[in-house]
C-alpha cells in the first residue's frame, strides 16, 4: 500500500542527481502508519494501540526485534550485534 | 479546542438537494478522518458518510448511496455534504465528527467509527412539501 | 447489526455497565442527554477525553466492549451509543442506544 515517489529532483544541475524520496502510502481501513522492514507502511491499529511493536516487524530481515521497556519503542539488533533504538513519542 | 460547526441545514422539499458543511478549528484537520452522523427525530444514531483525511477514499451508508457525496477543502478547514433526491426519512440532525488519529504526512487514513473523540452540535434538516 | 441492552439502571453510587458487541476495529462509546450535544466518553476501546470524569472506562474483551460507569451519578442519566465497524470492516455502524436510568 506504499510507494517511494521521487521529489525535488534539481534539474537546473544536469550533475546534480540529489532527490529527495518519500513514501506515499494509502492505508485500508483498520490500519495506520507504521513501520514495516525499516520503511513506512500502514499497519493494522490495533498493533499500535497496543504498542505491540514487534509485531509489525519493523527491523530489516535477519535483525532482531525486542521491545523497549513500557514498550516505549523497539531495538532491531543486527547479526553483528549493533543494536538501533527507535522510540515512539 | 476542538470546535465542529455544522450549517446548512433547514427546510427542504422533496427530490431537492442541500450542501451541509462543518467548519473545523482548533487542530490539523488535514491529518484527520471525518464523518457525518445523522439522528432522525427521537431516533438513534446512524452513520452516513465518511472521507480519509486526504479526501482520496469516500464511504457512504446504504441509504444514502447514490445519493450522497462528501467532500472536503483541507485548505479551509471544511467537511462537505451534498445530498441529492431528498426524501421525507432524510430528516433529522446532521452530525460532523472527527476521528481521533492523527495521520502524518505521507500517508492516506481512513477514520474509525470508535475513534470518534469531537461532534459538532449539528444541523437541523427536514424534508417535507 | 451491533447489541447493546436498550435500558439500564442503576442507583447512585452504583456501578452500571453497558455491553457492546458485533463490530470490528475499535470501539467508542457516545452520551447523549435530551436536548443536549453528543459527548464522546470513550473511544478507541479505552481512551477517556481529557474532560470526561475518571468514572467512565472501556474495556474490550474480543469483540465485546463494556463500558463502566463507577459510582454512578444523578447527571449521568442518558442515553448511551456504541459506534464501531461493522463486521465486513467497511462502512461505520451504531448500536440502537441504551438508556440509562439512575434510580
Known amino acids: 500500500t506504499c510507494e517511494i515517489v521521487t521529489l525535488d529532483r534539481d534539474s537546473s544541475q544536469p550533475r546534480r542527481t540529489i532527490a529527495r524520496q518519500t513514501a506515499r502510502c494509502a492505508c485500508r481501513k483498520g490500519q495506520i502508519a507504521g513501520t514495516t522492514r525499516a520503511r513506512p507502511a500502514c499497519v493494522d491499529a490495533r498493533i499500535i494501540k497496543t504498542k505491540q511493536w514487534c509485531d509489525m516487524l519493523p527491523c530489516l530481515e535477519g535483525e532482531g526485534c525486542d521491545l523497549l521497556i513500557n514498550r516505549s519503542g523497539w531495538t532491531c539488533t543486527q547479526p553483528g550485534g549493533r543494536i538501533k533504538t527507535t522510540t515512539v513519542s | 479546542a476542538v470546535t465542529l460547526d455544522e450549517s446548512g441545514g433547514g427546510l427542504q422539499t422533496p427530490g431537492g438537494a442541500l450542501r451541509l458543511s462543518c467548519s473545523a478549528s482548533g487542530f490539523t484537520f488535514s491529518s484527520h478522518g471525518m464523518f457525518w452522523v445523522r439522528q432522525a427525530p427521537g431516533k438513534g444514531l446512524e452513520y452516513v458518510s465518511e472521507?480519509?483525511?486526504?479526501?482520496?477514499?469516500?464511504n457512504y451508508g446504504s441509504a444514502v448511496k447514490g445519493r450522497a457525496t462528501i467532500s472536503r477543502d483541507n485548505g479551509q478547514s471544511t467537511l462537505y455534504l451534498q445530498m441529492n433526491s431528498l426524501r421525507a426519512e432524510d430528516t433529522g440532525t446532521y452530525f460532523c465528527a472527527r476521528s481521533t488519529y492523527e495521520c502524518p504526512g505521507g500517508f492516506s487514513c481512513w477514520g474509525d467509527t470508535g475513534q470518534i473523540d469531537a461532534w459538532g452540535h449539528g444541523t437541523e434538516v427536514i424534508v417535507s412539501s | 447489526a451491533l447489541t447493546q441492552p436498550s435500558s439500564v439502571s442503576a442507583n447512585p453510587g452504583e456501578t452500571a455497565k453497558i455491553t457492546c458487541s458485533g463490530g470490528?476495529?475499535?470501539y467508542g462509546w457516545f452520551q447523549q442527554k435530551p436536548g443536549s450535544a453528543l459527548v464522546t466518553v470513550i473511544y478507541?476501546?479505552?481512551e477517556r477525553p481529557s474532560d470526561i470524569p475518571s468514572r467512565f472506562s472501556g474495556a474490550l474483551s474480543g469483540s465485546t466492549n463494556t463500558l463502566t460507569i463507577t459510582g454512578v451519578q444523578a447527571e449521568d442519566e442518558a442515553d448511551y451509543y456504541c459506534g464501531t465497524e461493522d463486521i465486513s470492516g467497511t462502512a461505520g455502524v451504531f448500536g440502537a442506544g441504551t438508556t440509562l436510568t439512575v434510580l
Open positions: 478507541w476501546d479505552d
Open positions: 470490528v476495529y475499535s
Open positions: 472521507i480519509t483525511n486526504d479526501g482520496s477514499g469516500t
